[in-house]
Interface confidence: medium
Amino acid sequence: QSYSISQLDIFSQETPLDMAPASFDDQYAGCLADMTAALPDLNHSEFQANKVYADGWAQANNQWQERRAWGSVWGSLPPSPPGFRDEHGVALLAYTANSPLHKEFNAAVREAGRSRAHYLHHFSFKTLHFLLTEALQLLRSHRSRGCQQVYRGVHGLRFRPAGPGATVRLGGFASASLKNVAAQQFGEDTFFGIWTCLGAPIRGYSFFPEEEEVLIPPFETFQVINTSRPTQGPARIYLRALGKRSTYNCEYIKEKKCRSGPCWLGSS
């Protein structure tokens, strides 16, 4: 048995391959600056509430500083796109490392969109969710690369199949690899071939750069092209990018503004 890239979804149970309706999928459209301004206080309160996050962030921050100081040893950090800050790099390192943070974060993301209240009051990874979302936007626009074929191996995750033609999302942030062999090696339960248009290559910011990792955001939608479940070997699922779909947008900022004056929340 084996594990997937960046400890992908290990230890998980059977899950439907669907639109992941409970996933928190905010794209922060129109509130990036407001969110950035809110980060210091928010991050501090989340550290207090979530030890795994605090410890994971501290370790990743140490690693980021080490890589900055000893770039020639690690292979120098790639040129960062405009707007890319240290905290984006730390967030990507924290996410890709072999620590429980990755698993807990994605489990929380999959549930945080059950309701707006659930996100606001029970999701203690708001900072990390925002930083990863923004980091992927920045990296994708910087690379100006269009869509790409990636591979994702998942261990311990059984999917209730969606038929060809179904529209699905991956439910959380999903790590995949540009290298077929890496994905197959680290997931013997389900193997995905994915044509992604919103995933961003994060090689230079990954704890394990050689995996040629691509990170796919939770709001990207895909069409199921084909599925197979052979008697031996992993189930195989092939997905093609369709677009993006979010139920939520700027929920934290909306809530902050509501606290300081009249507000209108719209349908979300």
Epitope: Q1, S2, Y3, I10, F11, K51, V52, D55, G56, Q59, Q63, A97, N98, S99, P100, L101, K103, E104, V181, A182, Q185, F186, F207, F208, E210, E211
Partner: antibody, heavy 117, light 106 residues
Framework: QVQLQESGPGLVKPSETLSLTCTVS????????WSWIRQPAGKGLEWIGR???????NYNPSLKSRVTMSVDSSKNQFSLKLSSLTAADTAVYYC???????????WGLGTMVTVSS | EIVLTQSPGTLSLSPGERATLSCRAS???????LAWYQQKPGQAPRLLIY???SRATGIPDRFSGSGSGTDFTLTISRLEPEDFAVYYC???????FGPGTKVDIK
């Protein structure tokens, strides 16, 4: 620095359940995965399973039906239960930290467990 | 499941000599996931090399790792008396270990 110490019975009867505990000292248990690995006398190493402080577990398929792992963050401890023991389970049992580099970077000293009537 | 094979089973050398240990995987292994451990009698294993070629903290520079794909090598450039031990390679993906190579004094 972080140190690990296994504890539990040295002798267990066949068909019974082995219970071992690993105590983590000198550091936080929360940022890592924690594993159990065993080694029969004169033989190689066999990974048993791993756990996180949130209780996410992952077991070696060959042992999965007999293994249960748990964690008590307040005591900085994690535990192994292995049921339906046979003589083939006689081994030195190690606990180890699953480091961020995806390796077992810190090991306990090991505890010898003999399965015999 | 990836199977690791180590060779030779036993390597008999003298202090000061160079030791070359081989680890072969049944299918391609990402080098991020290949590690080497040293184990002396009555002791727990100790991490030597991770990521195929990175030395763990406190490991002397006479130990080096190399390789990619299916073939990996641990080299001890000049054997010291304390280096005589059993060496295991490990693939993190499946947390499997090779059977070990014993380096003993000729």
């Amino acid at each position: 620095q972080v140190q690990l110490q296994e504890s539990g019975p040295g002798l267990v009867k066949p068909s019974e359940t082995l219970s071992l505990t690993c105590t983590v000292s000198g550091g936080s248990i929360s940022s890592y995965y924690w594993s159990w690995i065993r080694q029969p006398a004169g033989k190689g190493l066999e990974w048993i399973g791993r756990i996180s402080t949130s209780g996410f577990t992952n077991y070696n398929p060959s042992l999965k039906s007999r293994v249960t792992m748990s964690v008590d963050s307040s005591k900085n401890q994690f535990s192994l239960k292995l049921s339906s023991l046979t003589a083939a389970d006689t081994a030195v049992y190690y606990c180890a930290r699953d480091g961020w580099g995806r390796v077992f970077d810190i090991w306990g000293l090991g505890t010898m467990v003999t399965v015999s009537s | 499941e990836i199977v690791l094979t180590q060779s030779p089973g036993t390597l008999s050398l003298s202090p000061g000599e160079r030791a070359t240990l081989s680890c072969r995987a049944s299918q391609s292994v990402s080098s991020s996931y290949l590690a080497w451990y040293q184990q002396k009698p009555g002791q727990a294993p100790r991490l030597l090399i991770y990521g195929a070629s990175s030395r763990a903290t406190g490991i002397p520079d006479r130990f080096s790792g190399s390789g990619s794909g299916t073939d990996f090598t641990l080299t001890i450039s000049r054997l010291e008396p304390e280096d005589f031990a059993v060496y295991y390679c490990q693939q993190y993906g499946s947390s499997t270990f090779g059977p070990g190579t014993k380096v003993d004094i000729k």
